[in-house]
Interface confidence: medium
Amino acid sequence: TLNSVLNSNAIKNLPPPLGGAAGHPGSAVSAAPGILYPGGNKYQTIDNYQPYPCAEDEECGTDEYCASPTRGGDAGVQICLACRKRRKRCMRHAMCCPGNYCKNGICVSSDQNHFRGEIEETITESFGNDHSTLDGYSRRTTLSSKMYHTKGQEGSVCLRSSDCASGLCCARHFWSKICKPVLKEGQVCTKHRRKGSHGLEIFQRCYCGEGLSCRIQKDHHQASNSSRLHTCQRH
């Protein structure tokens, strides 16, 4: 269950680092959303190798992706898993380690010389084969740092948000991904109640801009669950 995954996100005692200062003893630290990691020993830290619950790739490290730990496992329980090295099987770019991307279900090198012409091809073809995923979230590493000399403007093809200019994010549009504007206050946003639901979006929205969060519009509280309107609102 999700609770058991959350509870197993243990805190371990580590030896004091050389010259290392410490967090304030006895303080409690909360993770958003909703996970509490109590402080205590000065040199405690969250064990990076324990299951780390996630809802999307961006919540994991750049060398990880978010998925169910078991094949065909409970879709509601997802954790950060180590990225896959070259020539390993994949279903989307985020599964492949930095410097690689997913092509025809295999992690391949994102060599500058041949990759540029394949961006759109791989995004579109991955939808039509056995490994279709709609490329859930953008690749988060140095995958395309060499390819894009200037940041993508609105409408430019991208793989991840850092490929886009400031104020834009990389979001799905039909079967490819393009730079779209980050949402402003009052704009309709998408709140994913269940992991996996964003895989159904053909026209993905950006996230809310800085200082905003996606919340139910106040006058829509009475509406049924399925029709509740979410908008970007100030924290």
Epitope: G23, V29, A31, A32, Y43, T45, E56, E58, G61, C80
Partner: nanobody, 125 residues
Framework: EVQLVESGGGLVQAGGSLRLSCTAS????????VGWFRQAPGKEREFVTG????????YYADSVKGRFTISRDNAKNTAYLQMNSLKPEDTAVYYC??????????????????WGQGTQVTVSS
């Protein structure tokens, strides 16, 4: 090598707001965890809040939860700390720090590699 520069500190009345900025030079910033720590006179430096490489995951000390908000703009190589409903006990030097890890699991000082010089925040009652 990443260099961090904090700005936005100052004197504010209790109940007021301040917004701190942490601007980084160096490429590693956009793929690393960023945290804010603070040190009040005569006290240890303590963790305030942290954010993972993408901004999708944030952590807060209980003492600031609901009042402080951390965010980042990787395109501008900048992290922000919005501090609302400030209290006199929030008075401290606030430090921005960046770690090598991309995950927001770094809650303690020794997990951070690069540090700013700090900016003073004083909350008067």
């Amino acid at each position: 090598e990443v260099q961090l520069v904090e700005s936005g500190g100052g004197l504010v009345q209790a109940g007021g707001s301040l917004r701190l900025s942490c601007t980084a030079s160096g490429r590693a910033f956009s793929s690393s965890v960023v945290g804010w720590f603070r040190q009040a006179p005569g006290k240890e430096r303590e963790f305030v809040t942290g954010i993972n490489w993408s901004g999708a995951r944030t952590y807060y000390a209980d003492s600031v939860k609901g009042r402080f908000t951390i965010s980042r703009d990787n395109a501008k190589n900048t992290a922000y700390l919005q501090m609302n409903s400030l209290k006199p006990e929030d008075t401290a030097v606030y430090y921005c720090a960046s770690g090598r890890d991309s995950r927001a699991r770094a809650l303690f000082e020794y997990e951070y590699v690069w540090w700013g010089q700090g900016t003073q925040v004083t909350v008067s009652s």
